[in-house]
Interface confidence: medium
């Protein structure tokens, strides 16, 4: 059968039916990420609380993240949500401190329960705070007389920042 002439149009172009199906470059502020396209897609515009992480090109869409004070939520940073402080979570009434027994070591997300060391048969080496999980130590049995040498506990985790956390702090 006859080959579709549009299949020869590379990414960054579209098959222009108004011009005898020749390959025309995508107009400004539009792109086509694959060949053989009959239209170019409109570039995403990073406006408002969104800021441009990657500019749109003729072959790829723009990528957005969030302006200072906000962080990304959703696939492809579809929303920006306010930051809170470590030791807090965002509720409908604003940033609230983590309840006793829970922690949050980031500026986003929810407060999570402290690790229950006893479930692993271990003791609490360092108490938890609103900002940090507890650090579990060796099990009580390991500390009994005559036990073999104890491996020192792993250091407490540094506050994690996901790749979507904003820059410029």
């Amino acid at each position: 059968g006859l080959q579709d002439p549009c299949s020869n149009c590379p990414a960054g172009t579209f098959c222009d039916n108004n011009r005898n199906q020749i390959c025309s470059p995508c107009p400004p502020n539009s792109f086509s990420s694959a060949g053989g396209q009959r239209t170019c897609d409109i570039c995403r515009q990073c406006k408002g609380v969104f800021r441009t992480r990657k500019e749109c090109s003729s072959t790829s869409n723009a990528e957005c993240d969030c302006t200072p004070g906000f962080h990304c939520l959703g696939a492809g940073c579809s929303m920006c949500e306010q930051d809170c402080k470590q030791g807090q979570e965002l509720t409908k009434k604003g940033c609230k401190d983590c309840c006793f027994g829970t922690f949050n070591d980031q500026k986003r997300g929810i407060c999570r329960p402290w690790t229950n060391c006893s479930l692993d048969g271990k003791s609490v080496l360092v108490n938890g705070t609103k900002e940090r999980d507890v650090v579990c130590g060796p099990s009580p049995a390991d500390l009994s007389p005559g036990a073999s040498s104890v491996t020192p506990p792993a250091p407490a985790r540094e506050p994690g920042h996901s790749p979507q956390d904003i820059e410029g702090r």
Partner: antibody
């Protein structure tokens, strides 16, 4: 209609703490942040800091050790405290609203002049 | 900190003139730039955000453009009420910073 009104003493002595209040009306605090900005006489604008509706704050590093911004939602009031002031802190101080949908200071108070002098 | 350098610092124009104010950022700020108008003794007023979007109620003669480090505010036909000082501001990263201002005066 949307209104922001700064208030506080117009004269502060060196080494004391400058305290200003921004009383707002005509909009829901949960949907906005509030910035404080200052402008020395005859000069440009300097950003002091912001408090977002969730209660989190961000400050200009050049002032961070001296600044506290807080909110009393029951009174619809935002406060600015600047400690250990000097003559260089003499300025018109503005509060300005920032919607959570766009990083722009879309409404400003009329400003209040604070002079630091003994 | 990101420096925002405005030029010119002042300019004279007549009613009906087309006027352009430029702002250069010391590093890439994407399109995270706003423009404000300030009249003597008054608070600034938002004109443009995200480099090119007019704030609500701003006349269409005001337009903004640019991305990266170079930005422009254009008044297509200056009106008597437009004589004021104009400031650009970046909000790509903390601390938020303003340009030094451009004073638009009557010729």
């Amino acid at each position: 209609q949307v209104q922001l009104q700064e208030s506080g003493p117009g004269l502060v002595k060196p080494s004391e703490t400058l305290s200003l209040t921004c009383t707002v009306s005509g909009f829901s605090l949960i949907s906005y942040g509030v910035h404080w900005i200052r402008q020395p006489p005859g000069k440009g604008l300097e950003w002091i800091g912001v408090i977002w509706s969730g209660g989190s704050t961000d400050y200009n590093p050049s002032l961070k050790s001296r600044v506290t911004i807080s909110v009393d939602t029951s009174k619809n009031q935002f406060s600015l405290k600047l400690s250990s002031v000097t003559a260089a802190d003499t300025a018109v101080y503005y509060c300005a609203r920032n919607p959570l949908t766009a990083t722009v200071m879309d409404y400003w108070g009329q400003g209040t002049l604070v002079t630091v002098s003994s | 900190d990101i420096q925002m350098t405005q030029s010119p610092s002042s300019l004279s124009a007549s009613v009906g003139d087309r006027v352009t104010v430029t702002c250069r950022a010391s590093q890439n700020v994407g399109t995270n730039v706003a423009w404000y108008q300030q009249k003597p003794g008054k608070a600034p007023k938002a004109l443009i955000y995200s480099a090119s979007y007019r704030d609500s109620g701003v006349p269409s003669r005001f337009s903004g453009s640019g991305s990266g480090t170079d930005f422009t505010l254009t008044i297509s036909s200056v009106q008597p009420e437009d004589f004021a000082t104009y400031y650009c501001q970046q909000y790509n990263s903390y601390p938020l910073t303003f340009g030094g201002g451009t004073k638009l005066e009557i010729k």
